[in-house]
């Protein structure tokens, strides 16, 4: 015997209190698939969250973060404070990267500079809190008689990560 609730389309729910008729989801609730016995409450984008996509009877609202914050977690479940380049977020707030580390984004942690010598290369441009070092040719390439080396292009300004 077919379940009468299977006929209830997205945007409705099978109302057991009313002889299993397909009742429309009440305002501020939704059902994204057919055959649902309840409608889910719409997500509310409040505080540091802002609405990226409004809720409808068939789909939940989607949130992102207000300026100065960025999304973390599946479906932007959290908003984390942005820091400046050259900083990382700690429990006490934004802190400058320690010497020998850098962060070229507004989020994430400070990472150690590249160790050029591990690749047998020399440091062409020193690192900063905001930029990694630029490794140059190996010392052997700089010996007399070696072909001239075109200096590398300046480090590219990083784009913002997708929010």
């Amino acid at each position: 015997l077919q379940d009468p609730c299977s006929n209830c389309p997205a945007g409705t729910f099978c109302d057991n209190n009313r002889n299993q008729i397909c009742s429309p989801c009440p305002p501020n609730s939704f059902s994204s698939a057919g055959g649902q016995r309840t409608c889910d409450i719409c997500r509310q984008c409040k505080g540091v969250f802002r609405t990226r996509k409004e809720c409808s009877s068939t789909s939940n609202a989607e949130c992102d973060c207000t300026p100065g914050f960025h999304c973390l977690g599946a479906g932007c479940s959290m908003c984390e404070q942005d820091c400046k380049q050259g900083q990382e977020l700690t429990k006490k707030g934004c802190k400058d990267c320690c010497f020998g580390t850098f962060n070229d984004q507004k989020r994430g942690i400070c990472r150690p500079w590249t160790n050029c010598s591990l690749d047998g290369k020399s440091v062409l441009v020193n690192g900063t809190k905001e930029r990694d070092v630029v490794c140059g040719p190996s010392p052997a390439d700089l010996s007399p008689g070696a072909s001239s080396v075109t200096p590398p292009a300046p480090a590219r300004e990083p784009g913002h990560s997708p929010q």
Partner: antibody, heavy 122, light 109 residues
């Protein structure tokens, strides 16, 4: 422009049939927008006839008194809803309104047509 | 569901506070809409979900109530407010969307 336009009203004899149309423009019926029919006899109250699910399913919600005489249907390709009225009586004389019942407005009728007059008389 | 409105008519003056009530025959939570209708015109949505003002509706209109008892209030009646007001259950289902029979607001005197 977002609007509903009814057509098909007119004079019909008792026992006759009539099909009213309601064409939507500027938006599409969907799971968020249900087309409905409401009527108003001269000098009388508004009377709810029924609504139909706005998406691709044919679920209808009807007033009990309409059973067997009035049927609501929809053609999504034309973005049009219909009211088929059979076995018409003098007391069915009324202005028939098409309305949009919107999830965003608590399923209230947030958009109405201008109405079409149906007169049942011999 | 039956909707009972009262009074069926009332007379008032510009500036008056006007209150119209609507009673549902069974609980409809907050699923109630209020409309204004002028002669020869289609109804206009004023309030939905019992208390939410529809877009473009002046703030002198307000709605309250839940369950079976609801109220529409016009805080200071304006000349353009003389009309008939209807409540409607939006508790979908067969016979779930009934209207009240209206309250006609006319000019006193």
């Amino acid at each position: 422009e977002v609007q509903l336009v009814e057509s098909g009203g007119g004079l019909v004899q008792p026992g006759g049939s009539l099909r009213l149309s309601c064409a939507a423009s500027g938006f599409s019926f969907s799971a968020n927008y249900y087309p409905c029919w409401v009527r108003q006899a001269p000098g009388k109250c508004l009377e709810w006839i029924g609504c139909i699910y706005g998406g691709s399913s044919d679920i209808t919600y009807d007033a009990q008194w309409t059973k067997g005489r009035f049927t609501i249907s929809r053609d999504n390709s034309k973005n049009t809803v219909y009211l088929q009225m059979n076995s018409l009586r003098a007391e069915d004389t009324a202005v028939y309104y098409c309305a949009r019942s919107a999830w965003y407005s608590g399923w209230g009728g947030d958009l109405w047509g201008q109405g079409t007059l149906v007169t049942v008389s011999s | 569901i039956q909707m009972t409105q009262s009074p069926s008519s009332l007379s008032a003056s510009v500036g008056d506070r006007v209150t119209i009530t609507c009673q549902a025959s069974q609980s409809i939570s907050n699923r109630l809409a209020w409309y204004q209708q002028k002669p020869g015109k289609a109804p206009k949505l004023l309030i939905y979900s019992a208390s939410t003002l529809a877009s473009g509706v002046p703030s002198r209109f307000s709605g309250s109530g839940s369950g079976t008892d609801f109220t529409l209030t016009i805080s200071s009646l304006q000349p353009e407010d003389f009309a008939t007001y209807y409540c409607q259950s939006t508790y979908y289902g067969n016979d779930g969307n009934a209207f009240g029979c209206g309250t006609k607001v006319t000019v006193l005197g």
